[in-house]
Amino acid sequence: EPTMYGEILSPNYPQAYPSEVEKSWDIEVPEGYGIHLYFTHLDIELSENCAYDSVQIISGDTEEGRLCGQRSSNNPHSPIVEEFQVPYNKLQVIFKSDFSNEERFTGFAAYYVATDINECTDFVDVPCSHFCNNFIGGYFCSCPPEYFLHDDMKNCGVNCSGDVFTALIGEIASPNYPKPYPENSRCEYQIRLEKGFQVVVTLRREDFDVEAADSAGNCLDSLVFVAGDRQFGPYCGHGFPGPLNIETKSNALDIIFQTDLTGQKKGWKLRYHGDPMPCPKEDTPNSVWEPAKAKYVFRDVVQITCLDGFEVVEGRVGATSFYSTCQSNGKWSNSKLKCQPVDCGIPESIENGKVEDPESTLFGSVIRYTCEEPYYYMENGGGGEYHCAGNGSWVNEVLGPELPKCVPVCGVPREPFEEKQRIIGGSDADIKNFPWQVFFDNPWAGGALINEYWVLTAAHVVEGNREPTMYVGSTSVQTSRLAKSKMLTPEHVFIHPGWKLLEVPEGRTNFDNDIALVRLKDPVKMGPTVSPICLPGTSSDYNLMDGDLGLISGWGRTEKRDRAVRLKAARLPVAPLRKCKEVKVEKPTADAEAYVFTPNMICAGGEKGMDSCKGDSGGAFAVQDPNDKTKFYAAGLVSWGPQCGTYGLYTRVKNYVDWIMKTMQENSTPRED
């Protein structure tokens, strides 16, 4: 516990002190006092540097003195033989004696008192920045007018902080400007403008004079501008060294002016104003800005419109333009949005055709559709070339976005029919010679494929079986071959309205309008063994003349067999109708006169016994197209005959083209349209 005074005596004082002693005393007086230590008696064995016995006075780490020998007072009015004055409140006294004393020494008597210290003068480091005031047990600092004492109670500064400037325009100067600024001060000024405005500071060179930098280039007094994470400065010297116009890009600016104890100059003066935050005129590729301006600032709104073929993709929605607003932070809203090339996507596939995988599906890319040649061709024209248009669709110059349609090529056999050896008035044929040939198994008959969904046959073939089973693509009708061929399933049978239905069909004598259409459930896939025959045109070019040649094919009766196993065919000439009338009916079911002959019938045959017969009904009488020699059309359908191996009667298909087209149109499915 600190005391104001005290006494220190050597061991056994005033008797002789013992040998080999080491004793210490820790003196402590109250804070703010120094210590006056004085000896009134000193009798200690003398030795060089007091090496044997000694009393040592230590202040902190410093030895204030080391005493030995005898002392007496030099002043008759004072008993003090030795004294010490320290400006600190702590002191240590250490007494040491060695192992022997040649004489009897009595030691020492000492006293300490707390003494006042003058902190204002007693120390090298001045405790106060301005005025120092000493008092007993302490001191206090004070300041000149307009200065205030900082929290450390030692430093004085000017009260120049805490000002917040919110006006859009203003002026700020250092304290006392243009008189010298206060030393040892830190002035902080805050400019806080509305969001969306940036602080712009302007200075004139002559309005700035601040103590210059030291030899190392460090400013002793400095002016610093801080805007967010950006700093301008520190600045010092005679004349402003920085840019005279500082665009801070921020609505908040802190101005910090720091001065030291020396070298005051006139200081500085600045002006500031708030500029609407500028947004950069960004280069957004493939787009146009509206309105177009040299400079855009806070709250400006632009419409960014993509050029043709470009779009803004946000999520899964594509748009051609978007709005962007210059925001308070100097950045554009919607800045992530970009005008990207329109992507038309993977082109749709088409039935019976293909499209090569495009290298790119972006705007301007080109694709080509092709049909599966030679069995299909592009019906709706346009060449099959499509480009990726600005609206995101694949577009053709002729068809626009409509897809090409691959439809079967008609009337072109993969292999032409050649009459080989004679077989009962005909020849063996291959299905590739007559790819339109359809086989009906009940009743045993034929038909002609005219497109993907329709089979043309004779009315008498289907009148008794409205759900016929049909096959295409096989030369042989042996079961194992049919199992490998394509079976066609009917959806509906359409018999010509002019065909007279009878109770007893076996007794029929009127085969007028012997024509029917079978609508199929599923489309037929065309190929080398399955391909339709053309229909006749309506022009007079398709009117048959006597002698015109046509081909018939089927699995009907031959001389040797009731039913042919493999397809047979023959080339027959058209004959006048009277030739058919003249032939005696082989097994008449009625009077010869009862048989009806009409202009809806073609008479053909009579040459070399070549004729159609039972089981060939419904098959096509195929004639070369007068306008395209590579194609065949169905001029007739095997209908009836007076006698096999003579002349036969065929339904004249040309007379029914309108009914055929109308029936197909009225009974088509949307996917066929």
Partner: antibody, heavy 119, light 107 residues
Framework: EVQLVQSGAEVKKPGASVKVSCKVS????????MHWVRQAPGKGLEWMGT????????IYAQKFQGRVTMTEDTSTDTAYMELSYLRSEDTAVYYC????????????WGQGTLVTVSS | DIQMTQSPSTLSASVGDRVTITCRAS??????LAWYQQKPGKAPKLLIY???SLESGVPSRFSGSGSGTEFTLTISSLQPDDFATYYC?????????FGQGTKVEIK
């Protein structure tokens, strides 16, 4: 009407071969597809194979691959079936059968030839 | 090869009974299935072809149905002449295999 006349019964030793003939009348062999079917005593029908004139190839049931050979002599309208490496399980009645048309599998059957394999 | 599984292997029934025999293919054979009747010492006789078509001359009490892999032969009213062994046969694939047979015997 197609008629099929087969060769007579045969008795063979294990390991031997047998060749059964089938003569067609009422039609020509070129117009027909000939199949061969066998039936062991008290057992079911087993299809052995056929000659496909369209493809010009012979198709055999997996079971008989490598042991059976089916041939045709169109000049005499006769079909042949030869089975080699005979074993007792091959004892059966062997039929030649013509393939039907328009979905009918078998049209005409031969009278059958009994082949007995016994040591 | 496509395997044909016929069931049951034996069936005991009386005259006038309705009899059903089933045949299952190991994979789809569309409608390419036939049913035969065989009596001892005789060649098989075709009853049904293309799964449901009745061969000419076969009594209408015989009927066939099914397509794909499941097929049935039905005798609507069993007659004394109908006691025999019945076989199904597929002819969709190149190998025209038979089922193992169903013997219909008098109860």
């Amino acid at each position: 009407e197609v008629q099929l006349v087969q060769s007579g019964a045969e008795v063979k030793k294990p390991g031997a071969s047998v060749k059964v003939s089938c003569k067609v009348s009422g039609d020509t062999l070129t117009e027909l597809s000939m199949h061969w079917v066998r039936q062991a005593p008290g057992k079911g029908l087993e299809w052995m194979g056929t000659f496909d004139p369209e493809e010009g190839e012979t198709i055999y049931a997996q079971k008989f691959q490598g042991r059976v050979t089916m041939t045709e002599d169109t000049s005499t309208d006769t079909a042949y079936m030869e089975l080699s490496y005979l074993r007792s399980e091959d004892t059966a009645v062997y039929y030649c059968v013509t393939e039907g048309l328009a979905g009918i599998p078998f049209d005409s059957w031969g009278q059958g030839t009994l082949v007995t394999v016994s040591s | 090869d496509i395997q044909m599984t016929q069931s049951p292997s034996t069936l005991s029934a009386s005259v006038g009974d309705r009899v059903t025999i089933t045949c299952r293919a190991s994979q789809s054979i569309s409608s390419w299935l036939a049913w035969y009747q065989q009596k001892p010492g005789k060649a098989p006789k075709l009853l049904i072809y293309k799964a449901s078509s009745l061969e000419s001359g076969v009594p209408s009490r015989f009927s066939g149905s099914g397509s794909g892999t499941e097929f049935t032969l039905t005798i609507s009213s069993l007659q004394p002449d109908d006691f025999a062994t019945y076989y199904c046969q597929q002819y969709n694939s190149p190998s025209w295999l038979f089922g193992q047979g169903t013997k219909v015997e008098i109860k």
